[in-house]
């Protein structure tokens, strides 16, 4: 029966068919569906979808939707069809499909699963055992990211105090979009007794640079010149340094923020690749001065803004005065 345009726009379309859900990799959940049966012939079909909590509404012509999500909780997608991109148009009856996390006692799942990307060269994940777990549980960590063809198993499981952990190579690739993606993580046990735990680690967060390495301290008049090696793998706009100078006589502790700075003064080894320099003003040369440096990523490059590197090894210059 022919309906004019106005009618087909307001008419509710039939529901989508064959809505199904599957998991790819570790944490990529994909829903697919077929167009509704008996939709108006003059209707240009669009699909309205949102997750169970009415989050992330989307209107699109594709018959699929995917999300990267740690599968620690049940997640549901509701899908309907409509004839326009208008959000105010009433879609068809919504069809829902849910996916549940792997089975198991929630109290057995590991907790505090978190990962840090060290110096853009390896990722180190750590976790605490679940409450209902035997002390001799053998854990396995699996990981996946876009530059891997398949899921990998982490080989270097270790224990540090109460925490278990595992580290794996993850080198920043030149592809500029590499850091826009995430690493998918799953931890379970070899025997299959514990409930698996999942995490998604965005590569723009949790980045911890290696500490700098102080190469040289020297005095020129009342200024202290500090030269250090920068951590590898970072571009200069993405790091800044904190230089701490402690004076044994005055017991002062001065802290300076430093932009990566070229070594242009004659006091420094010049044009040495990957080194930075800084001049600390007004330092007493006849007292003992101890310097250490740490480095942090810039929030415009990496979003996690609380991770400093460890401190460099200290280096001292000057003479410790005898107490009289």
């Amino acid at each position: 029966d022919y309906k004019d345009d106005d009618e087909s726009r307001t008419e509710t379309q039939p529901p989508v068919t064959n809505l199904s859900v599957s998991v790819e990799n570790l944490c990529t959940v994909i829903w697919t569906w077929n167009p509704p049966e008996g939709a108006s012939s003059n209707c240009s079909l669009w699909y309205f979808s949102h997750f169970g909590d009415k989050q992330d509404k989307k209107i699109a012509p594709e018959t699929r939707r995917s999300i990267e999500v740690p599968l620690n909780e049940r997640i549901c997608l509701q899908v309907g069809s409509q004839c326009s991109t208008n959000e105010s148009e009433k879609p068809s009856i919504l069809v829902e499909k849910c996916i549940s996390p792997p089975e198991g006692d929630p109290e057995s799942a590991v907790t505090e699963l978190q990962c840090i990307w060290h110096n853009l060269s390896y990722m180190k994940c750590s976790w605490l055992p679940g409450r209902n777990t035997s002390p001799d549980t053998n854990y396995t960590l699996y990981y996946w990211h876009r530059s891997l063809e398949k899921i990998h198993q982490c080989e270097n499981i270790f224990r540090e105090g109460q925490y278990f952990g595992c580290s794996f190579d993850l080198t920043k690739v030149k592809d500029s979009s590499f850091e826009q993606h995430s690493v998918q993580i799953m931890v379970k046990d070899n025997a299959g007794k514990i409930k698996p735990s999942f995490n998604i680690v965005p590569l723009t967060s949790r980045v911890k640079p290696d500490p700098p390495h102080i190469k040289n301290l020297s005095f020129h008049n009342d200024d202290l010149y500090v030269q250090w090696e920068n951590p590898q793998n970072f571009i200069s706009r993405c790091l800044f340094y904190e230089v701490e100078v402690n004076n044994s006589q005055t017991e002062t502790h001065n802290v300076f923020y430093v932009q990566e700075a070229k070594c242009e003064n004659p006091e420094f080894e010049r044009n040495v690749e990957n080194t930075s320099c800084f001049m600390v003003p007004g330092v007493l040369p006849d007292t003992l001065n101890t310097v250490r440096i740490r480095v942090k990523t810039n929030k415009l490059c990496y979003e996690d803004d609380k991770l400093w590197s460890n401190w460099s090894q200290e280096m001292s210059i000057g003479k410790k005065r005898n107490s009289t």
Epitope: I235, R237, F240, Q259, K262, K296, N298, K299, L300
Partner: antibody, heavy 118, light 104 residues
Framework: EVQLVQSGAEVKKPGESLKISCKGS????????IGWVRQMPGKGLEWMGV????????RYSPSFQGQVTISADKSISTAYLQWSSLKASDTAMYYC???????????WGQGTLVTVSS | EIVLTQSPGTLSLSPGERATLSCRAS???????LAWYQQKPGQAPRLLIY???SRATGIPDRFSGSGSGTDFTLTISRLEPEDFAVYYC?????FGQGTKVEIK
């Protein structure tokens, strides 16, 4: 001495295009970010976006994304802020400022007043 | 997106008094990124404090910054006549709305 010198005041009509400039001197222009900040009449400061002249990497505040373009010419140590089609609501004082990697704006230009009126 | 809320909106004090300005973040932020500025009418802003507590070059020691997490404070120990101005806190792409310090 670090200095940022901005181009002069502009009076424009709605729909016109505009490009204002900010010339840096007294420091390594390619080693620091340049940020742009808007201040509408009688209002507070709004962060528009930044550029790193060393590699022309830019970041915009969501409210200004697509509204303006930030660029730089490192050969003449100059950063630019441009509009393709001005609106009356773009009337404001625009400041450029030097930004080290920890995000504070440590040296400021004198400001460029842009007035858009029919 | 992080929101910085400054209080009070206006602070009426006399020269010689102590001024305490507050800046509260909607979520925890790194103190490395928190800065304070002073702006006088008809002038560009001037950086006072960076890294929450480090004084910028040439800033008198009556200005001090403190705080961490979500709560940050700018203190002017003894107000001088030239300190009456508007003060802004900032963290990268976010500025607070400003606190005006005016003469009582």
């Amino acid at each position: 001495e670090v200095q940022l010198v901005q181009s002069g005041a502009e009076v424009k009509k709605p729909g016109e295009s505009l490009k204002i400039s900010c010339k840096g001197s007294g420091y390594s222009f390619t080693s620091y970010w340049i940020g742009w900040v808007r201040q509408m009449p009688g209002k507070g400061l709004e962060w528009m976006g930044v550029i790193y002249p060393g590699d022309s990497y830019t970041r915009y505040s969501p409210s200004f994304q697509g509204q303006v373009t930030i660029s730089a010419d490192k050969s003449i140590s100059t950063a630019y802020l441009q509009w393709s089609s001005l609106k009356a609501s773009d009337t404001a004082m625009y400041y450029c400022a030097r930004m080290p990697n920890w995000g504070s704006l440590d040296s400021w230009g004198q400001g460029t007043l842009v007035t858009v009126s029919s | 997106e992080i929101v910085l809320t400054q209080s009070p909106g206006t602070l009426s004090l006399s020269p010689g008094e102590r001024a305490t300005l507050s800046c509260r973040a909607s979520q925890s932020i790194s103190s490395s990124y928190l800065a304070w500025y002073q702006q006088k009418p008809g002038q560009a802003p001037r950086l006072l404090i960076y890294g929450a507590s480090s004084r910028a070059t040439g800033i008198p020691d009556r200005f001090s910054g403190s705080g961490s997490g979500t709560d940050f404070t700018l203190t002017i120990s003894r107000l001088e006549p030239e300190d009456f101005a508007v003060y802004y806190c900032q963290q990268y792409e976010t500025f607070g709305q400003g606190t005006k310090v005016e003469i009582k």
